[in-house]
């Protein structure tokens, strides 16, 4: 029987700016029952403060809602582990909120082949931002990402969308059923996970661009 | 603890490049950016740029088009190429990792240095 | 580039002095996130540098309460309240808000 090992906040994870969650590996638990806290302070700050929520983010995780959120302040935060047999404490981790927002996937994409009389077909592509996410507020830039491919291809096209929700190709294989995907990232942050699949028939007579 | 140990040639022809390693323990490079740094001798510090926890990199504009920076995550060793090197390249050369989690400037770990001299 | 220039470029002082820094940037190095990225650091003869101060005026784990940070803008003062032996070396201020980063040229505090 031992005190117990070590633990490491591995990650931390916000939606908006707005909450995040934080979670970390156990370190060997000694043989003996173990628990776990998190504490933290805020820049400029002596103060320790327990995690406000050990729910929301599954095991081993410390949740902090919109009241313990603050985008402009950097948190200093420490997971303790203790047994029978004494303690071990984490590194400390500085999170900075700005720096660790990977939002949900894009909403609604819709995908139609347009076949204007006068000019070249296309394929529009069209998305909405996540609803987590106010753009409004003029605090969050949001870059996307398209990928497709014929559905028996094993390569990617990407395109980079910059801020729009809406996109045209041009370059189109006739006849071929293709896979489409958006993902979006914050101008600091992570990109999303891709949006679910949507499928789109090219029609035989699409032509293809130059 | 967090440590960063730096490896690389310490004398440079003129017209050559420069490779230096620097090796980290105590964290990942999945979770924090590490950046080039170097010093003249006797002269002040030059930030050359980073290579970010998801492998996006940042560079100084003066020095861009010779500089490059990689990392193997699965190593934990992040790597400095410099090419076409002239005598007032000669620094000490360090690598110092990011002090927030997933972030970028702020360099809370340095390694120790490794001194290029560039003569032929 | 933002040009981070540091006065004074030598400063001599004696031991209990308090000391006082200048760091000004070319333009105002606010981040896009409203965050301000400008550091402290004292590099030691023959050391590493080593992190004093993050954004602004937040002590790094382990420094001292005699060092502390202010200012907003392009206008940063680092301020030593009680200098001891071991805070002699040059300091250099830092910006990482804008790419790409700068330094500042450096001040020495050194005995009088």
């Known amino acids: 029987q031992l005190p117990p090992g070590k633990p490491e906040i591995f990650k931390c994870r916000s939606p908006n700016k707005e909450t995040f969650t934080c979670w970390w590996r156990p370190g060997t638990d000694g043989g003996l029952p173990t628990n776990y806290s998190l504490t933290y302070h805020r820049e400029g700050e002596t103060l320790m403060h327990e995690c406000p929520d050990y729910i929301t983010g599954g095991p081993n995780s410390c949740h902090f809602g919109k009241q313990y959120t603050s985008m402009w302040r950097t948190y200093i935060m420490m997971v303790n582990a203790t047994n029978q047999m004494g303690s071990s404490f984490s590194d400390e981790l500085y999170v900075d909120v700005t720096y660790i927002v990977q939002p949900d996937p894009p909403l609604e994409l819709a995908v139609e082949v347009k076949q204007p009389e006068d000019r070249k077909p296309y394929l529009w592509i069209k998305w909405s931002p996540p609803t987590l996410i106010d753009l409004k507020t003029g605090w969050f830039t949001l870059l996307y990402e398209i990928r497709l491919k014929p559905e028996k291809a094993a390569e990617w096209e990407i395109h980079f969308a910059g801020q729009q929700t809406e996109f045209k190709i041009l370059s189109l294989h006739p006849g071929q059923k293709y896979l489409v995907q958006v993902r979006c990232k914050p101008d600091h942050g992570y990109w999303s996970a891709w949006s679910p699949a949507t499928f789109i028939q090219i029609p035989s007579d699409f032509t293809m661009n130059d | 603890q967090v440590q960063l140990q730096q490896s690389g040639p310490g004398l440079v022809a003129p017209s050559q490049s420069l490779s230096i390693t620097c090796t980290v323990s105590?964290?990942?490079?999945?979770?924090?950016?590490v950046n080039w740094v170097r010093q003249p001798p006797g002269k002040g510090l030059e930030w050359l740029g980073i290579?970010?926890?998801?492998?996006?990199?940042n560079y100084n504009s003066a020095l861009m088009s010779r500089l490059s920076i990689s990392k193997d995550n699965s190593k934990s060793q992040v790597f400095l190429k410099m090419n076409s090197l002239q005598t007032d390249d000669t620094a000490m050369y360090y690598c110092?990792?990011?002090?927030?989690?997933?972030?970028?400037?702020?360099?809370?770990?340095w390694g120790q240095g490794t001194l290029v001299t560039v003569s032929a | 580039d933002i040009v981070m220039t540091q006065t004074p470029l030598s400063l001599p002082v004696s031991l209990g002095d308090q000391a006082s820094i200048s760091c000004r940037s070319s333009?105002?190095?606010?981040?896009?996130?409203?965050?301000?990225?400008l550091e402290w650091y004292l590099q030691k003869p023959g050391q590493s540098p080593k992190l004093l101060i993050y954004k602004v005026s937040n002590r790094f784990s382990g420094v001292p309460d005699r060092f502390s940070g202010s200012g907003s803008g392009t206008d940063f003062t680092l301020k030593i309240s009680r200098v001891e032996a071991e805070d002699l070396g040059v300091y250099y201020c830092f910006q990482g808000s804008h790419v790409p980063w700068t330094f500042g040229g450096g001040t020495k505090l050194e005995l009088k």
């Open positions: 105590g964290f990942s490079l999945t979770s924090y950016g």
């Open positions: 290579i970010g926890a998801g492998g996006s990199t």
């Open positions: 110092a990792r990011s002090l927030y989690y997933y972030g970028s400037s702020s360099f809370a770990y």
């Open positions: 333009q105002s190095i606010v981040h896009s996130n409203g965050n301000t990225y």
